[in-house]
Interface confidence: medium
């Protein structure tokens, strides 16, 4: 889970451990803030979960390329 | 901290193979893409293919298919590209690198490949 | 394949001044593109990443900027350890591309 304990800053100290499949997940957000202890990012579930997620995990990113190719649709 | 090594310069005839290899440490090669580019002598970079150890799944640019193989080895943290029926256009320094998304963030430290009859 | 276009291929400068590369997509490519330096025999190393994603000790003169298809690097004062090769690259779809390179010199 992220922690605002230093409001406005979300800052996550631990990533899942298991892969979220792409279905459950409705966007997520980096955190790159030097305030934080390490870059991650956060998905936010369809059910509106919020999970710290490792962002140099493959499946990370492969899940936030499938979120942004969903909102961005190239040009024909 | 994360390094990637490669094996040595390799001198081969047309027709022929090559395989580098790339070894990872400080990172754990199941959880990332393992890309492979290339770069001719004075000229830009060039990308290959990458893996997906984990499930051995590759891509490639398609002007290389059929003639480049990239294996994985995760007991080893190494990562491997042959490239058969050398030509002289073939002669470069090839890269392996850790893939984030598309981009690389850690490169090894090339292997010359010199193709020469 | 999405085709990469840098300019200039070269140019001149000198200590502390202000340099800006650019680099056009044929396509949108949604701001995935990064920006790599390049020493003689050496392997590249990752400046920029992404919209303005600085790689983490990479020094805050180096600024990337540009959407759509039309991007830039800029190195705000340029300082005797950045003459290199820069090359962009986009990552939106494999085949990843690269620009052909600017080779920054001292004037």
């Known amino acids: 889970q992220p922690d605002a304990i230093n409001a406005p800053v979300t800052c996550c100290y631990n990533f899942t451990n298991r892969k979220i499949s792409v279905q459950r997940l409705a966007s997520y957000r980096r955190i790159t803030s030097s305030k934080c202890p390490k870059e991650a990012v956060i998905f936010k579930t369809i059910v509106a979960k919020e999970i710290c997620a490792d962002p140099k995990q493959k499946w990370v990113q492969d899940s936030m390329d499938h979120l942004d190719k969903q909102t961005q649709t190239p040009k024909t | 901290q994360v390094q990637l090594v490669q094996s040595g310069a390799e001198v081969k005839k047309p027709g022929s193979s090559v395989k580098v290899s790339c070894k990872a440490s400080?990172?754990?090669?199941?959880?990332?893409?393992m890309h492979w580019v290339r770069q001719a002598p004075g000229q830009g970079l060039e990308w290959m293919g990458r893996?997906?150890?984990?499930?051995?799944?590759?891509k490639f640019d398609p002007k290389f298919q059929g003639r480049v193989t990239i294996t994985a080895d995760t007991s080893t943290s190494t990562a491997y590209m042959e490239l058969s029926s050398l030509r002289s256009e073939d002669t470069a320094v090839y890269y392996c690198?850790?893939?984030?998304?598309?981009?690389?963030?850690?490169w090894g430290q090339g292997t010359t490949v010199t193709v020469s009859s | 394949d999405i085709q990469m276009t840098q300019s200039p291929s070269s140019l001149s400068a000198s200590v502390g001044d202000r340099v800006t590369i650019t680099c056009k997509a044929f396509e949108d490519i949604y701001n995935r593109r990064a920006w790599y330096q390049q020493k003689p025999g050496k392997a590249p190393k990752l400046l920029i990443h992404?919209?303005?994603s600085l790689e983490h000790g990479v020094p805050s003169r180096f600024s990337g900027s540009g959407s759509g298809t039309d991007y830039t690097l800029t190195i705000s004062s340029l300082q005797p350890e950045d003459f290199a090769t820069y090359y962009c690259q986009q990552f939106w779809s494999a085949p990843y591309t690269f620009g052909g390179g600017t080779k920054v010199e001292i004037k």
């Open positions: 992404g919209a303005t």
């Open positions: 893996i997906d150890p984990d499930n051995h799944n590759t």
């Open positions: 400080g990172l754990t090669i199941s959880h990332t893409y």
């Open positions: 690198a850790r893939g984030v998304f598309g981009f690389f963030d850690h």
